[in-house]
């Protein structure tokens, strides 16, 4: 890894678990300044592997709302607009970090948690098992 | 929103910015216990809108390594294995939370940051504006 010289202006931590427990400012800085606001908004319908978005809410988590993609079909949409089972719609999944309140119901104490979310779907060639 | 009764065992915070600055335990709890480790690993090659994964490293960020998808083609792969321009490969993007060291180079002080990442690609019908 890369060794970074410590900034002398860093806050001190008296926590016995240091450096495992850290201070986090929740005023979110949004880096997505130069993006097209339309982005992926209509891809779920225009895709050959379309998906629906389901709201997953958990007040003990930050962010409390996460949208999960569920592929609409087993196959993919062909040029005629029909579902073609020569291909498969599959979810593209990503591991993301969220903050989990710990102990539960505490407003100012969290633990990092890794969760797997389905972001959208893509159309893939199926894995074909050949039989003699 | 949902009102949650405060747990009396919560740690106190003397921070003047409370509740915007919170304590976070970095011992990550992984909820992805029952997932297939292979997951989306080969979709990037099997997809009709294949993508390459590019490593984005930033030691001032947690996690420091994020993988970004870049669609390989302008069009999508058809049944003959050729790029077909009737369709377009587009990235599926997701906003994720990361921790940014603040002040810089501090090991125990972070700020939440929202970044947009491309997770994979999907094949979409183009926006057609003109009729013969």
């Amino acid at each position: 890894g890369i060794t970074i010289p410590r900034n002398p202006g860093c806050p001190n931590s008296e926590d016995k678990n240091f450096p495992r427990t850290v201070m986090v400012n929740l005023n979110i800085h949004n880096r997505n300044t130069n993006t097209n606001p339309k982005r992926s908004s209509d891809y779920y319908n225009r895709s050959t592997s379309p998906w629906n978005l389901h709201r997953n809410e958990d007040p003990e988590r930050y962010p409390s709302v996460i949208w999960e993609a569920k592929c609409r079909h087993l196959g993919c949409i062909n040029a005629d607009g029909n579902v073609d089972y020569h291909m498969n719609s599959v979810p593209i999944q990503q591991e993301i970090l969220v903050l989990r309140r710990e102990p539960p119901h505490c407003p100012n104490s969290f633990r990092l948690e890794k969760i797997l979310v389905s972001v959208g779907c893509t159309c893939v060639t199926p894995i074909v098992h050949h039989v003699a | 929103g949902i009102t949650i009764p405060r747990n009396p065992g919560c740690p106190n915070s003397e921070d003047k910015n409370f509740p915007r600055t919170v304590m976070v335990n970095l011992n990550i709890h992984n909820r992805n216990t029952n997932t297939n480790p292979k997951r989306s690993s080969d979709y990037y090659n099997r997809s009709t809108s294949p993508w390459n994964l590019h490593r984005n490293e930033d030691p001032e960020r947690y996690p420091s390594v994020i993988w970004e998808a870049k669609c390989r083609h302008l069009g999508c792969i058809n049944a003959d294995g050729n790029v077909d321009y009737h369709m377009n490969s587009v990235p599926i993007q997701q906003e994720i939370l990361v921790l940014r060291r603040e002040p810089p180079h501090c090991p125990n002080s972070f700020r939440l940051e929202k970044i947009l990442v491309s997770v994979g690609c999907t094949c979409v019908t183009p926006i057609v504006h003109h009729v013969a």
Partner: antibody
Framework: EVQLVESGGGLVQPGGSLRLSCAAS????????MSWVRQAPGKGLEWVST????????DYADSVKGRFTISADTSKNTAYLQMNSLRAEDTAVYYC???????????KYYPWFDYWGQ | DIQMTQSPSSLSASVGDRVTITCRAS??????LAWYQQKPGKAPKLLIY???SRASGVPSRFSGSGSGTDFTLTISSLQPEDFATYYC?????????FGQGTKVEIK
């Protein structure tokens, strides 16, 4: 009204670099593929590169691969062509062109160069 | 790469003449062909796409036909503003390729 305005051309020594810009207006920039097509003095048209701003996906002619880089800034509605390691044979008029998807009876819909810069 | 060969390279014609330009692809390109008109010092202009569909604002005297490897651009009655160079272009596969051009001159 659709407009494509190129800039950035000039005289450069072999091995030098140049960056061309194509400012687009009058249409939804991310919905179209944008290309660069060149024409050497007294010669025909040669496709150079294409980008789809919505995806960032790109394609290049073999003659420029590894030397030229096409990019797009969707906030500025501008496509760019960064040309490095320039050679005498790169001397040409470079046109920026939009590829619009058109319906036709024969092949449903497909992209064609419908507007060109001047 | 798919080679596009136009013939003739140049032709002389008079106003009112019927003019035919042909374009041959080195392999089948179905109907993935366009025709462009270019006047000196100007950018090309789309005339025909999908081998036979006329682009918006293009006069009806311009027509396109063909599929597979052989294509034709026809100007039914040549007008003074039609004197220019015409290019065919295939969009069947990358790289996109153009014909070498046909120059239509005044006789």
């Amino acid at each position: 009204e659709v407009q494509l305005v190129e800039s950035g051309g000039g005289l450069v020594q072999p091995g030098g670099s140049l960056r061309l810009s194509c400012a687009a207006s009058g249409f939804s920039f991310t919905s179209y593929m944008m290309s660069w097509v060149r024409q050497a003095p007294g010669k025909g048209l040669e496709w150079v590169s294409t980008i789809y701003p919505e995806s960032g996906a790109t394609d290049y002619a073999d003659s420029v691969k590894g030397r030229f880089t096409i990019s797009a800034d969707t906030s500025k509605n501008t496509a760019y062509l960064q040309m490095n390691s320039l050679r005498a044979e790169d001397t040409a008029v470079y046109y920026c062109a939009r590829e619009g998807y058109y319906y036709s009876t024969s092949i449903k819909y497909y992209p064609w160069f419908d507007y060109w810069g001047q | 790469d798919i080679q596009m060969t136009q013939s003739p390279s140049s032709l002389s014609a008079s106003v009112g003449d019927r003019v035919t330009i042909t374009c041959r692809a080195s392999q089948s390109i179905s109907s993935y062909l366009a025709w462009y008109q270019q006047k000196p010092g100007k950018a090309p202009k789309l005339l025909i796409y999908g081998a036979s569909s006329r682009a918006s604002g293009v006069p009806s005297r311009f027509s396109g036909s063909g599929s597979g490897t052989d294509f034709t651009l026809t100007i039914s009655s040549l007008q003074p503003e039609d004197f220019a160079t015409y290019y065919c272009q295939q969009r069947y596969s990358q790289p996109i390729t153009f014909g070498q051009g046909t120059k239509v001159e005044i006789k």
